[in-house]
Interface confidence: low
């Protein structure tokens, strides 16, 4: 893994220990950003419409990417876009959306071992000469001594969640992405109510292990709206 | 070899404005998030702000909200903290340092002493 | 804010000793705290991340364990070099806190 370099471009798959959200796909544009209160796990959203203005990836929800909104638009106003699904054209990693990678300017599945080693390769390659093209596109990346070679684990510094060891995604804290663990039955989960109520998070948790969904939990369905709590549920 | 270097400490008047510098060199600056810690003559360490490696994202610390400023210019490979109001208890010595996992802060500058006092 | 109560606060030791420092976080932060050591007119060295991944060039002798609320710094056999001043720092909520500091001094 890279476990010296810190909010990377291209993380799909992402987000906390405290409260933030899991993107849902399908919006055009993102909301204003989550709040998290300091020192707390209550986490809000600003629920208008507006779309939130980003430099790269990192600053967008989990299932979006930084882009203008215009086709070849102006490159100086970039928006939190929707991530594109399976078979959609892109042009680096951070376009598809959890499960899927970029590949000949389309979007495909993750083969996972076959994604890992391919990271792997290119992080081998560019060890010591200063160069990377892990997202899709060339980008000038220092690769210090705390580069391992092994898969990242629990904290560890990554780029995506290929970088991280079986079990792990990638998911933002704070200002950087480190690896954390994927989300088991019955752990709560975030889950947008509105596609596109979500924005950038200071933590993000990780999404639901395989044959789960983020669902809402039975006992809650009379809840009131804002107190609604999802869980990772069986198909 | 990671070096990053602060600078722009020193006498201010109470309700008086500095600029921190901090010059970093070694590795790729836009890649790190980057901080500022604080430390006041014989006390302990206090974390100040932070900033996400495009300068998109910022924190801070309670104490220093709406007062400081912390911003970035990575064609510089420069962080900056922009201080204004100045108070009496924001004397210490200001260290730059970047992030690393678990947000932990790998290497640090040798800190800049800024002296609020009339 | 999250608290971070380290202790003791100072301590006496020789070299060669084993050291024990512990730091207290007032709600759960996972294995979210880093270890500084500091010595005067100097700036923080990290030494463990993680709760207990060790930093690339930091001795063996240190090591770091716990995971929740309680968490211990250890340092096997205290070196002359080691007599500093200890920080613990949690990363799990904003605003990051560090403990008040345990200073580690000659017998």
């Known amino acids: 893994t890279l476990n010296s370099v810190l909010n990377s471009n291209a993380i799909k798959n992402l987000p906390p220990p405290l409260g933030g959200a899991a993107g849902h796909p399908g919006s055009a544009v993102s909301a204003a950003p989550g709040i998290l209160y300091p020192g707390g796990n209550k986490y809000q959203t600003i629920d208008n419409y507006q779309p939130y203005p980003c430099a790269e990836d990192e600053e967008c929800g989990t299932d979006e990417y930084c882009a203008s909104p215009t086709r070849g638009g102006d490159a100086g106003v970039q928006i939190c876009l929707a991530c594109r699904k399976r078979r959609k054209r892109c042009m680096r990693h951070a376009m598809c959306c959890p499960g899927n990678y970029c590949k000949n300017g389309i979007c495909v599945s993750s083969d996972q071992n076959h994604f890992r080693g391919e990271i792997e390769e290119t992080i081998t390659e560019s060890f010591g000469n200063d160069h990377s093209t892990l997202d899709g596109y060339s980008r000038r990346t220092t690769l210090s001594s705390k580069m391992y070679h092994t898969k990242g684990q629990e904290g560890s510094v990554c780029l995506r969640s290929s970088d991280c060891a079986s079990g792990l995604c990638c998911a933002r804290h704070f200002w950087s992405k480190i690896c954390k663990p994927v989300l088991k039955e019955g752990q709560v989960c975030t889950k947008h109510r509105r596609k596109g109520s979500h924005g950038l998070e200071i933590f993000q948790r990780c999404y639901c292990g395989e044959g789960l969904s983020c669902r809402i939990q039975k006992d809650h369905h009379q809840a009131s709206n804002s107190s609604r709590l999802h869980t990772c549920q069986r198909h | 070899e990671v070096q990053l270097l602060e600078s722009g400490g020193g006498l201010v008047q109470p309700g008086g404005s500095l600029r921190l510098s901090c010059a970093a060199s070694?590795?790729?600056?836009?890649?790190?998030?980057m901080t500022w810690v604080r430390q006041a003559p014989g006390k302990g360490l206090e974390w100040v702000s932070a900033i996400s490696r495009s300068g998109g994202n910022t924190y801070y610390a309670d104490s220093v909200k709406g007062r400081f400023t912390i911003s970035r210019d990575n064609s510089k490979n420069t962080l900056y903290l922009q201080m204004n109001s100045l108070r009496a208890e924001d004397t210490a010595v200001y260290y730059c340092a970047r992030t690393y996992s678990y947000g932990s802060f790998d290497y640090w500058g040798q800190g800049t002493l800024v002296t609020v006092s009339s | 804010d999250i608290q971070m109560t380290q202790s003791p606060s100072s301590l006496s030791a020789s070299v060669g000793d084993r050291v024990t420092i512990t730091c207290r976080a007032s709600q759960n932060i996972k294995t979210y705290l880093n270890w500084y050591q500091q010595k005067p007119g100097k700036a923080p060295k990290l030494l463990i991340y993680g709760a207990s991944s060790l930093e690339s060039g930091v001795p063996s002798r240190f090591s770091g364990s716990g995971s929740g609320t309680d968490f211990t710094l250890t340092i096997s056999s205290l070196q002359p070099e080691d007599f500093a001043t200890y920080y613990c720092l949690q990363t799990y909520s904003v605003p990051l806190t560090f403990g008040g500091g345990t200073k580690v001094e000659i017998k």
């Open positions: 070694g590795f790729t600056f836009r890649s790190y998030g």
